[in-house]
């Protein structure tokens, strides 16, 4: 099923969203820190 319909599951999507959210938080934090240091 490597090329089938089951390659885009909700559980996989949720994990991707969690990673995106985490990265956005980390990058946002770094950006705020950079602005603060200026």
């Amino acid at each position: 099923h490597s090329d089938g319909i089951f390659t885009d599951s909700y559980s996989r999507y949720r994990k991707q969203m969690a990673v995106k959210k985490y990265l956005a938080a980390v990058l946002g934090k770094r950006y705020k820190q950079r602005v603060k240091n200026k």
Epitope: H1, D3, G4, I5, F6, T7, D8, S9, Y10, S11, Y13
Partner: antibody, heavy 115, light 109 residues
Framework: EVQLVESGGGLVQPGGSLRLSCAAS????????MNWVRQAPGKGLEWIGS???????YYASSANGRFTISRDNSKNTLYLQMNSLRAEDTAVYYC?????????WGQGTLVTVSS | DIQMTQSPSTLSASVGDRVTITCQSS???????LSWYQQKPGKAPKFLIY???NLASGVPSRFSGSGSGTEFTLTISSLQPDDFATYYC??????????FGGGTKVEIK
Amino acid sequence: EVQLVESGGGLVQPGGSLRLSCAASGFTVSSAVMNWVRQAPGKGLEWIGSIVASGTTYYASSANGRFTISRDNSKNTLYLQMNSLRAEDTAVYYCARGGGEFFIWGQGTLVTVSS
Amino acid sequence: DIQMTQSPSTLSASVGDRVTITCQSSESVYSNYLSWYQQKPGKAPKFLIYQASNLASGVPSRFSGSGSGTEFTLTISSLQPDDFATYYCAGGYSENIVGFGGGTKVEIK
């Protein structure tokens, strides 16, 4: 924001053709499994078919060669080409994301086949 | 063709009732790819449960799913006013096809 917006529905004569569009935002259609699902007035949901990341398409037996699913990666848009339309194709057509389970849905677009 | 049989087709219930809807498939679903949806008139379906028993994000805990193979159940432990709607099951199959149940309308008794 993750969103799907269908367009292209309307009134079409029996035997005619129509192409529906589904514009995605918040994710890329080329890496997702995208589907078309329809619902005739007062009836249940019916899966039409799917397109997977590789571009391979899968269809319900009821689609019987009259319906074609495609996508334009540059426009992040999914399409449903419908040919030789019949009165029984009158329905709200939804696009939805997910493989075997539909976790993001558009608002739907109504297609009416009538003379 | 694969048949997804949902029962009952209509269910009359009161607020606070425990409600159970069943979905039977003529063929075993692939890797428990059985999902449930709620639909209100004029609206798109809402994703409730995935892989038979997992609650989608934001779905109240009064909803639960169970089952495997060919027999599945959706339960609402205590029916709320917002829950009066039509519910559909959908199964994913190894042939890369999807089938929907006929729907169950939950109406006010």
